[in-house]
Amino acid sequence: GSTVPPMVNVTCSEVSEGNITVTCRASSFYPRNITLTWRQDGVSLSHNTQQWGDVLPDGNGTYQTWVATRIRQGEEQRFTCYMEHSGNHGTHPVPSGNSHHHHHHHH
């Protein structure tokens, strides 16, 4: 099949003890190969501080996955989610307030 670029969105969980969990989700992409990872201060966040979901079929012939990490509340600006899929690159900031979601579709 032809390439279908991912829809990427970044969400924040509830705060606990000054920390928040930020999750970056990629969905509706094809083919299955994708890079999804967090950057802190513009460089790679160490792998042992990130959790990845499996790349799973979403029922439409496309795939979905996620990566999450815990960060200090108030330091959201320092983190971005980096996505690479079929030669397509994108970076996605953490929304500044817990109620916001960032959605990006890559073309």
Epitope: V43, Q77, T80
Partner: antibody, heavy 119, light 107 residues
């Protein structure tokens, strides 16, 4: 557009301190980004020295950690480099630059200022 | 620290030729690579980020590729304004480090 301009003495004596200023126009250094110092030695080797970010957090190259300090004056939208106990090996062109948090590459640099360490 | 090794250190080429500069990292930098051009007496200028993405305003005769530890910058049909020095820089981790540079001279 973000513009950066370095300034400071062009000549420093060995064992003294080197102090440089980067004046930023077109963007507030407290809004976002990491504000960096990079130097280029006479044989053109480039070395990342460190940064101060929008919130005042610093990060230094371990090779310089005991000698370097980066500070800022938010009222003047300036950030500063201080390097203590300099030797002739610190002779270089010093650049200020910044990067956004989508990746630590440097989209714009100041014009650079040559600092010579000599008795 | 990750060391960046550039080759060749210098090359001579004629206008209209194609040249390729390579950069090898001492560890896997996962496409966290930038390229810069520097003219004599001027500041470096960003050409490429994320290993393959051309910065705004960079002519399409420039292209970049690579993965893992090996990266390259290619200039098709070299123009007079392309002469100067080229540097790679990784941003996988701190400290950020640069290659020693490749000087492209007129034959």
């Amino acid at each position: 557009d973000v513009q950066l301009q370095e300034s400071g003495p062009g000549l420093v004596k060995p064992s003294q301190s080197l102090s440089l200023t980067c004046t930023v126009t077109g963007y507030s250094i407290t809004s976002d980004y990491a504000w960096n110092w990079i130097r280029q030695f006479p044989r053109n080797k480039l070395e990342w020295m460190g940064y101060i970010n929008y919130s005042g957090t610093t990060n230094y190259n371990p090779s310089l950690k005991s000698r370097i300090s980066i500070t800022r004056d938010t009222s003047k939208n300036q950030f500063f480099l201080q390097l203590i106990s300099v030797t002739t090996e610190d002779t270089a062109t010093y650049y200020c630059s910044y990067y956004r948090y989508d990746g630590a590459w440097f989209p714009y640099w100041g014009q650079g200022t040559l600092v010579t360490v000599s008795a | 620290d990750i060391q960046m090794t550039q080759s060749p250190a210098s090359l001579s080429a004629s206008v209209g030729e194609t040249v390729t500069i390579t950069c090898r990292a001492s560890g896997n930098i996962h496409n966290y690579l930038a390229w810069y051009q520097q003219k004599q007496g001027k500041s470096p200028q960003l050409l490429v980020y994320n290993a393959i993405m051309l910065a705004d305003g960079v002519p399409s005769r420039f292209s970049a590729s690579g993965s893992g530890t090996q990266y390259s910058l290619k200039i098709n049909s070299l123009q007079p304004e392309d002469f100067g020095s080229y540097y790679c820089q990784h941003f996988w981790s701190f400290p950020l480090t640069f290659g020693a540079g490749t000087k492209v001279e007129i034959k």
